[in-house]
Structure formats: structure tokens, C-alpha cells
Amino acid sequence: SITGISPITESLASLSTYNDQSITFALEDESYEIYVEDLKKDKKKDKVLLSYYESQHPSSESGDGVDGKMLMVTLSPTKDFWLQANNKEHSVELHKCEKPLPDQAFFVLHNRSFNCVSFECKTDPGVFIGVKDNHLALIKVDYSENLGSENILFKLSE
């Protein structure tokens, strides 16, 4: 369960991959597409609004939470649109929705060094947002083998 329905804090950041590619969002045919691409030097990075929530339940990873609580986030690149996990299709999609947001829009935040993070699905522990074929996808992680695979690591920059 998530403690309270209001975020404890919010921040605006650009999202890039561990290998320094940018996550961008483009409106195409009245729906948003998500791309992973090399940005030209002068191009401005897309920003995402991260809303942080406290969750009472630890995730499947023995993570480093705050006082035993796990941090959860929602990610919104534009007003009224949120990143959501589609577990059936193993995809990450942008959907327009109203609050209260569905569970598919919540991700457990795992902090790593050098401002890197990973996002674990609230609805499917052990499944993370990752990069596959220049798109975001859901990737099942075998903790014993793959915890640090670069394709599930992202960098937050102000």
C-alpha cells in the first residue's frame, strides 16, 4: 500500500540510459511514443515530472529504502500523461489518466550510485523498466545474475 495519496515530493528531471542515450517523448497520431536515442548536442532534453511516494511494503530486492519504507515514483513527461507498465505486452506506454492513478503507473525506485536508478513495477516485482531495441520495455530480472544489467539502469539529471 502507498502511504497517503499525495506525493511526499516532486522533481523535474531528464531521463537517460546508463549508456548516455536520452529518453524522448513524441506526439504521433494523437498518442505519445517513447524513444531511446542519441541527442544532438544542441537539442534540449525532454523533462519528466517524478512524483515520489512512500510505500510500506518492501520490494523483491533487498533495497536501500528510507527507514524500511520503499520509495515509489510515478513519471509524467507531459500534463495528464503517465508512464505505465503493460505487463501482458511487456511494454512501457504513455497513457492519459486521472487520479487516483492505477497501480501500473507506480514503480519502486532503486537508488544506485552516480545518480543512477532503476524502476521496478509495483504490479510485478522483479520486472523493471528497461531498454530494448531503442524503446522502453519491461524486463524480467534474475537478481542472482542480472541485477546490474545496464539496460535497466537510468540516469536522472536536473
Epitope: 549508456n19 548516455d20 533487498s62 550510485s113 552516480f114 539502469l153
Partner: antibody, heavy 119, light 110 residues
Amino acid sequence: EVQLLESGGGLVQPGGSLRLSCAASGFTFSNYYMHWVRQAPGKGLEWVSSISSRSSHQYYAGSVKGRFTISRDNSKNTLYLQMNSLRAEDTAVYYCARLGLRHDAFDIWGQGTLVTVSS
Amino acid sequence: QSVLTQPPSASGTPGQRVTISCSGSSSNIGHNAVWWYQQLPGTAPKLLIYASNMRRMGVPDRFSGSKSGTSASLAISGLRSEDEADYYCAAWDDSQKAVVFGGGTKLTVL
């Protein structure tokens, strides 16, 4: 075998410059954040600088900011540390280290190269 | 002065259990994973513990790490003469945007 090999250390006068290199082998160098950590004689470890896998982000300890520059050449599997305006307190063994993807910690270290700043 | 605080020395006899503490703050240990390194005389540091309590492959299970709040500790049970070394804790610090180390603890096996 996964290996890091530093070179370029030596004796330099205060105010002088030196460029350290670290040759990586046995792993996909371009996938990893790389780092420099130093250890003054008889003292503890001090993190110096880090660089992201494709050089978009560099980080520096306050004690070296503005004087040291970290860089990498992924085509040569080599990490560099350009050290300018050297001071006596920069005397140390300089280690290059890899940030392990799985461990999120410095999992592979070189053997170190000694930098002595003295007149 | 180091950002993370460790006792400068620790000692024990063979077979004993020894614990080394590492104290930090909410911006480093409180929010991030702790790493423990062993440095034998004249050699480069070697990673023992990552993610606060995960033993690196090949590290004997006599070594264990734990974390509570803004402090961490490394426990070595069944102490052996080859464990005599310097031990360092380290963590990422959110506010400094830097890796911070403890000052190191010299472990002597009596």
C-alpha cells in the same frame, strides 16, 4: 582475464602536470563507468574522479575540481586523468577502478601508479 | 577528515568474531548501498561486500555486512591470520555527488 593497468606516474614538481592512463582488457570497456581513486602514503582511500560510459557525465572530488580532468577513449579501451597545478598533497598511489554493473561498487582495481609531487 | 567514520583499529584472536563499524549520514549510508573493501599490505583494495549485505562471489561466508539507518558494519567470524588487513567502508553521497570512504580500520589478528 579482466584487467586494469595504470601508467604515467612519476616525480613531478609542484605546479607541474602529469597524465595518467589506465588500459582496460577482458571486458566491454564502453559499458562501464570508470573511476580514479588515490591513496596517500600511509593514509586511507580517497575517491578522485569518475566518468560515465560514453563521457556525458564527469564527477570530481572537491580537492581536485578545476585542476584534474578525467576522460576516456572507448576505441582504445583507455581511461585518462590529466593532472594540472599539482600540489604536494596530491602525492599518492593512483588506482583506476571499474564500477561493476551488478555490484554497483568498484569491483575491479588496477595495481596503482605512484605520483610524487616534490621539489 | 573522512565523511564516513570507522574506528582506526580493531583486533581479535584466531577463531574470534570481530565487528567493524561505519557511521555516516542520511545523504550517504542512510539512502544508499554500503561497500566494504579489504586491502592487504602493498596491494590494491578488494571488494568484499556490496549492496550493504551482499557478499561478492568468492568471498568466504565468514564475512558479512549489515546496515541500519545511517550506520553499517562488517562482521568477520572465525578470524584467521590472513584476515589481517585494512578495511574500508564506502558509499555514494547524494548531497556531495561523490563517493565517500571511511578512514579505514586496521585489523590485527593477535
